[in-house]
């Protein structure tokens, strides 16, 4: 029951996380800037991974997409790649984990197969979450190093004087969404991996055996005891004794013919 709950919760947490990663990737507010030296009106600029927008206090808003691929900063391309890889891995992980859920029966799928699928999806979620966290962190670092140092450096260009605009660069909402979403996906992945341990059949345990003395006809077969090592034929912890001896799992089973003589 705990395994099913852990697996189910891991799936839900990862699902929310991946939805958040997708949302963060699509959002425009990765970086926001205040052009506070502008004498006209409050002008706010905000940029995403795909387009740049300007919003004025008058209500006017305009966005323009980055239509070039080659001319963009390498760091932006790297962040885009990390986020997309995160989404793709997360989506595949979700697909795999749906079939791995203990509460969903698909044909005669073995628990070992479900355990493997749960582990696979868990690893995918972990990598997906790490990709998202890495992407957002790279972008945040780019903002800190490149832009918060932005002062009014003046130099002369061909068409006259050029200066960097004194802007106040701040982390956009998408960064926080990305960090939280990446963290959730990571946590969900860890939960799936934990659930996998509970799903995997124990192959090296020694099952306790209870003996029921139910009369004179109980036949004890010498040499009948075989410890399941995982290498022999008894990998599924099958019942060894014919008589009243049963494994702990079968104590509640129906009475055998030997119980009534």
């Amino acid at each position: 029951m705990a395994v099913t709950a852990c697996q189910g919760l891991g799936f839900v947490v990862s699902l929310i996380g991946i939805a958040g990663i997708i949302a963060a990737t699509c959002m425009d507010q990765w970086s926001t800037q205040d052009l506070y030296n502008n004498p006209v009106t409050a002008v706010f600029n905000y940029q995403g991974l795909w387009r740049s927008c300007v919003r004025e206090s008058s209500g006017f808003t305009e966005c323009r997409g980055y239509f070039t691929l080659l001319g963009l900063p390498a760091m932006l391309q790297a962040v885009r790649a990390l986020m997309i890889v995160g989404i793709v891995l997360g989506a595949i992980g979700l697909l795999v984990s749906i079939f791995a859920l203990k509460c969903i029966r698909i044909g005669s799928m073995e628990d070992s197969a479900k355990a493997n699928m749960t582990l696979t999806s868990g690893i995918m979620f972990i990598v997906s979450g790490l990709c998202a966290i890495a992407g957002v962190s790279v972008f945040a670092n780019m903002l800190v190093t490149n832009f918060w140092m932005s002062t009014a450096n003046m130099y002369t260009g061909m068409g006259g004087m050029v200066q960097t605009v004194q802007t106040r660069y701040t982390f956009g909402a998408a960064l926080f969404v990305g960090w939280v979403a990446g963290g959730l996906t990571l946590i969900g992945g860890v939960m799936m991996c934990i659930a996998c341990r509970g799903l995997a059949p124990e192959e090296t345990n020694y099952k306790a055996v209870s003996y029921h003395a139910s009369g004179h006809s109980v036949a004890y077969k010498p040499g009948g005891f075989k410890a399941s090592t995982g290498f022999g034929s008894n990998t599924k912890n099958k019942k060894i004794y014919d008589g009243g001896a049963r494994t702990e799992d079968e104590v509640q089973s129906y009475p055998s013919k030997h119980d009534y003589v």
């Epitope: 970086s31 502008n38 002008v43 006017f60 050029v162």
Partner: nanobody, 122 residues
């Protein structure tokens, strides 16, 4: 390389009119605010008029009602229509643009033109 080229300056009589234009060219991604500043001999550079992409404008008190700023976002061009010119309007008029480049849309720059001379004299 981005260039701001001003044109339309010259000598005009008091009460006359002039139309300045400034065209920005180069690998521009988006121009935010465009404007006109002026610098009279022996004085500091001062704001004349500015305009945002959304056409919000601001004028210096000394030119309000006489000067009109406009822009064409598609052509990356700003205009300054100057009417009822006075001798005190004599100055070098500089075009200004806050813009970002196609190669780095995350960084904003202020570019200045080299200026056009406006002389109001009888």
């Amino acid at each position: 390389q981005v260039q701001l080229v001003e044109s339309g300056g010259g000598l005009v009589q008091p009460g006359g009119s002039l139309r300045l234009s400034c065209a920005a060219s180069g690998s521009i991604f988006m121009i935010n605010v465009m404007g006109w500043y002026r610098q009279a001999p022996g004085k500091q550079r001062e704001l004349v008029a500015v305009i945002t992409r959304g056409a919000s404008t601001n004028y210096a008190d000394s030119v309000k009602g006489r000067f009109t700023i406009s822009r064409d976002n598609a052509k990356n061009t700003v205009y300054l229509q100057m009417n009822s010119l006075k001798p005190e309007d004599t100055a070098v008029y500089y075009c200004n643009a806050d813009l970002n480049l196609a190669s780095d849309p995350f960084k904003w720059y202020t570019y200045w033109g080299q200026g056009t001379q406006v002389t109001v004299s009888s």
